[in-house]
Interface confidence: low
């Protein structure tokens, strides 16, 4: 039969209404149950195994077309025989402590092997000795603190930092910077451990012993560290190891908060600069350098074997042919690796996926095709750095940034039980609110109400009343490459926590040994029912995205956001009035383009209710002007120093991977632009990224006027 | 009550172009939410689908008429159009515009016909 | 293309009497099966969707049943003016949409 033909025996809404009817929570279940049962390490055999099954079950499920896609990049694993920790030494380089090499299995998985210790992946080897500094989160801000503030160096220092708040990586960089040579990571119950909930396997909090895994490279959207801008093949030229991109220079490690207990108690120096700085330990959070009083002559000294390798990664790549719009790629992709056993990371986010494959299958069997090909991936090796899904992307380039309609991500589902978290274009934000409404809320109290009455009440808006929150994407997941790099609309959608009421940073068990099913079982989702919602809206996206005759996509929310953002540089900019006037610093033409940008989308969208629908020609020619519009805000050239991130309005903050900041390259030339000792030249900058930012405005208006 | 009215020529020469035209009279296209369409009748081949339109623009086709086949909407006059090239003198039938059952209902059951029109393909 | 089996070719019976028309598909449609009745000269008419729903108008004499490959139409009582040819169609795979030969009823 004829792949191009139509959708099936149903209408849009029909088609819609089975394919969300046939997602079923016991589904869900039963996958994350068979994604759970061993380690999925990057590289390893245990991986593998997964995506030759994922493999074989795409193919049953009914896709036309699943394939393995291999790469050989550059991953990193801690020396079996030669195992990494931290000691307290004595003046006579005796060891006095040691932290611990492993965490305690969960109950029920003792006998299982291959459990990673924790690692900093991408550490170097090393055995650096010395004092210690507390340096808060690790943030840039924390380092002005000290530095500026405090006047404490880390120069030739090990510094000790808590998870939280700002991408691991980060915190590393910013470490390097400050002159520090090691660095130790650890998890404070502050932030990874919510009162009055017991610790795992009696409740969802973090044990003492629960440590956070987690690579901390640099790599601002470059892929395997030793093939940049090139997928890792068998023809790759790779860099030496030496000019590997974004590796870290001194050795990290993280550990838990019972060793960091031993680590900190007895840290002299300075108190913390103010509250913000204090934990849950019981502890001082003195800052350091050193011990105090009578244990100022121990030092600490890291002990990190851990090495690098070049291996071989899969990812699983099926594809469900369109019927009337086979060149038009819709993209659904999250990962498969896992640290340990991924019981939330990421599998909790494959099984919806595998649910969503089985579902688009279901229907393709009964004859009902989308109208544009949706790819399914199930990534390898996304917490080495994004690697399956960015050399997947590199290895695809042309393809995807002729055809590509918009990527939608799906790693973790749950975060927590309490409402949806979205982070997206503003291209996509009217199709999130809207199938929103036609979702059922699963919280409690809300029954008989739609998934967006509870979204909203539960996280509103801070700018638009009456209307749910949604956020810029950032990095830190396989969206990156597609929308940072590539210019394609991307989004993202998961159940979250009460940021309001519960203060910890992710959930507490991210990256530990005990992210298990039983976590997902027991403690966030019985009945499977916040899985089933969140795969309901990322299934309801891709099949919109797939089969709306008119692509889902409204330029004039983008129109809003680039005002909205427009403004907010323009505010951070006014914070400093004498330079923006002595040198001769305007946001006019920005905001001249932005107003162009405004009355042209009104214009489109005009033009998009009188088009005639039933002209293919007509059709595909404003189609693709709004597939476009995305790619229009890409700057070949990328942003100073990351040639990767190319996204003129949108890119992971320099400070931290996992926020995303506006008008990037604006942003970065004025921050902290007071202490730069060359202000002429520094305004200059400000000055040129101000014309960039409003060229590519203008430009991105001119592909939506009429096209002749 | 919704009417569906065919028209167009009762002779059409071989190799020619067939253009038929339904006009819908009681219902809007663009409100209704019904999916319109064609078939066609031959004493030795029995009932045929031609293909479906939806007022969005949506064209379905049944394969073995693709290559010839494309069906067109005028929603501002209420109605929509057969065109089906290189005709030859299997493509004579009694020609139907059809609404399928709905609305929202998709590419369902046939509920409402038009009375048809003869179609005769000859030199 | 699914195919669709009408049987018998014809069926002739009095009037009164119980008509039980089938159809067979070449593979399983589920329920998205359709019936019409064409009375000579006229267009088709939808009598019964969903394997077993009657159209808005059909009277209660005529009955649908079946799923999967299977289908039934069943006229209780036959009145003169059930003569008709009768036709079932699939909406499960497509495209192509398909149609049964027909049964052509005769009354005697």
């Known amino acids: 039969k004829p792949s191009n033909e139509a959708t099936g025996n149903v209408s849009h809404s029909g088609m819609k209404k089975e394919f969300l009817h046939e997602l079923k929570a016991e589904n869900i279940k039963k996958f994350l149950y068979n994604f759970t049962r061993t380690p999925h390490l990057a590289g390893t055999q245990n991986n593998f195994e997964l995506a030759k099954q994922i493999h074989d079950q795409w193919k049953e499920f009914g896709l036309d077309l699943v394939e393995l896609s291999h790469y050989d990049v550059l991953l990193s694993y801690p020396n079996k025989t030669h195992p990494n920790y931290i000691s307290i030494i004595n003046e006579d380089g005796n060891e006095i402590f040691k932290t611990s090499l492993s965490e305690q299995p969960p109950p029920g998985y003792e006998n299982i092997s291959d459990v990673v210790p924790p690692y900093s992946a991408f550490s170097p080897q090393g055995t650096p000795e010395g004092d210690l500094v507390y340096v808060n989160y690790a943030r840039t801000e924390d380092f002005f603190k000290l530095e500026r503030e405090m006047k404490i160096s880390c120069s030739g220092k090990i510094v000790i930092a808590r998870y939280g708040k700002v991408f691991r990586g980060n915190m590393v960089k910013n470490a390097q910077l400050a002159g520090a040579k090691g660095m130790i990571l650890y998890s404070d119950p502050a932030d990874y451990f919510v009162p009055a909930v017991k610790s795992y396997p009696d409740g969802w909090n973090l044990p003492g012993g629960g440590v956070q895994r987690g690579n901390v490279l640099n790599l601002n959207g470059a892929g395997d560290p030793l093939t940049p801008g090139y997928p890792a093949n068998e023809h790759a030229y790779r860099h030496e190891l030496t000019n590997a991109v974004g590796l870290p220079s001194i050795p990290v490690h993280p550990i838990g908060y019972d060793d960091a207990q031993k680590l900190l108690e007895h840290m002299g120096g300075p108190a913390p600069p103010d509250s913000s700085w204090k934990g849950g330990l019981k502890v001082p959070y003195n800052v350091g350098p050193g011990f105090a009083g009578n244990f100022s002559t121990q030092k600490v000294k890291m002990h990190i074997h851990s090495y690098t390798k070049v291996t071989r990664i899969y990812n699983v790549i099926g594809t469900l042919k369109g019927a009337l719009e086979p060149d038009r790629y819709v993209i659904l992709g999250g990962h498969r690796d896992a640290w340990v056993f991924g019981g939330i990371d990421p599998q909790s986010g494959a099984a919806v996926v595998h649910e969503i494959v089985r579902s688009f299958g279901t229907l393709k069997k009964k004859g009902r095709r989308p109208r544009r090909t949706i790819l399914f991936a199930s990534w390898d090796a996304e917490e080495f750095g994004l690697l399956g899904s960015t050399e997947w992307a590199e290895e695809h380039s042309r393809l995807l940034q002729e055809r590509g309609v918009a990527y939608i991500n799906a790693d973790s589902s749950i975060e927590g039980n309490y409402t949806l978290r979205v982070d997206c274009t503003p291209l996509m934000y009217s199709l999130v609110y809207n199938l929103t409404k036609e979702l059922q809320s699963p919280d409690e109290g809300f029954e008989g109400k739609s998934l967006y009455d509870s979204w909203k009440e539960k996280s509103p808006s801070p700018e638009f009343i009456g209307m749910p929150r949604i956020s810029k994407l950032g990095s830190g997941n396989d969206f990156e490459v597609f929308f940072q790099r590539l210019g394609i609309a991307s989004g993202r959608a998961r159940y979250t926590k009460n940021w309001k009421t519960n203060k910890v940073s992710s959930y507490p068990l991210y990256h530990s040994v005990y992210e298990t099913y039983e976590l997902v079982v027991k403690f966030y989702d019985p009945t499977f029912k916040y899985h089933l919602t969140v795969a309901q809206v990322r299934g309801a996206m891709v099949f919109e995205l797939a089969n709306s005759i008119v692509l889902p996509f409204d330029c004039q929310s983008y129109a809003v956001a680039l005002k909205k953002y427009a403004d907010t540089i323009y505010n951070i900019s006014m914070k400093h009035p004498q330079e923006m006037k002595a040198y001769m610093i305007s946001f006019d033409s920005l905001f001249s383009a932005v107003n162009n940008f405004t009355d042209v989308a009104s214009k489109f969208n005009q033009r998009l209710q009188e088009l005639d629908k039933s002209n293919p020609i007509l059709l595909r020619i404003m189609n693709d002007q709004l597939m476009y519009l995305e790619r229009a805000f890409i700057d070949p050239l990328g942003l100073p120093g990351r040639p990767f991130y190319r996204h003129i309005i949108y890119a992971p903050s320099s400070h931290n991977k996992y926020a995303g900041e506006s008008f990037p390259g604006i942003y970065d030339a004025l921050f902290d632009i007071s202490s730069k000792v060359n202000a002429s030249k520094a305004w200059n900058e400000v000055k040129r990224q101000i014309s960039i930012a409003t060229f590519t405005v203008q430009a991105a208006a001119e592909t939506l006027r009429e096209v002749a | 009550q919704v009417q569906l009215q065919e028209s167009g020529p009762g002779l059409v020469k071989p190799s020619e172009t067939l253009s038929l035209t339904c006009t819908v009279s009681g219902a809007s296209f663009s409100s209704s939410g019904y999916y319109w369409g064609w078939i066609r009748q031959t004493p030795g081949r029995g009932l045929e689908w031609i293909g479906t339109m939806f007022y969005s623009g949506a064209t379905y086709y049944n394969p073995s008429l693709r290559s010839r086949l494309t069906l067109n909407m005028d929603t501002s006059k209420q109605e929509f159009t057969l065109r089906l090239t290189s005709v030859t003198a299997a493509d004579s039938a009694v020609y139907y515009c059809v609404r399928h059952r709905g609305p929202d209902s998709g590419l369902d059951a046939f509920d409402l016909w038009g009375q048809g029109t003869q179609v005769t393909v000859s030199s | 293309d699914v195919v669709m089996t009408q049987s018998p070719a014809t069926l002739s019976l009095p009037p009164g009497e119980r008509a039980t028309l089938s159809c067979r598909a070449s593979q399983s449609v589920s329920s998205y099966l359709a019936w019409y009745q064409q009375k000579p000269g006229q267009a088709p008419r939808l009598l019964i969707y969903g394997a077993s729903t009657r159209a808005t108008g059909i009277p209660a004499r005529f009955s649908g049943s079946g799923s999967g490959t299977e289908f039934t139409l069943t006229i209780s009582s036959l009145q003169s003016e059930d003569l008709a040819v009768y036709y079932c169609?699939?909406?499960?795979?497509?495209?192509?949409?398909?149609f049964g030969g027909g049964t052509k009823l005769e009354i005697k």
């Open positions: 169609q699939q909406y499960n795979d497509w495209p192509p949409l398909t």
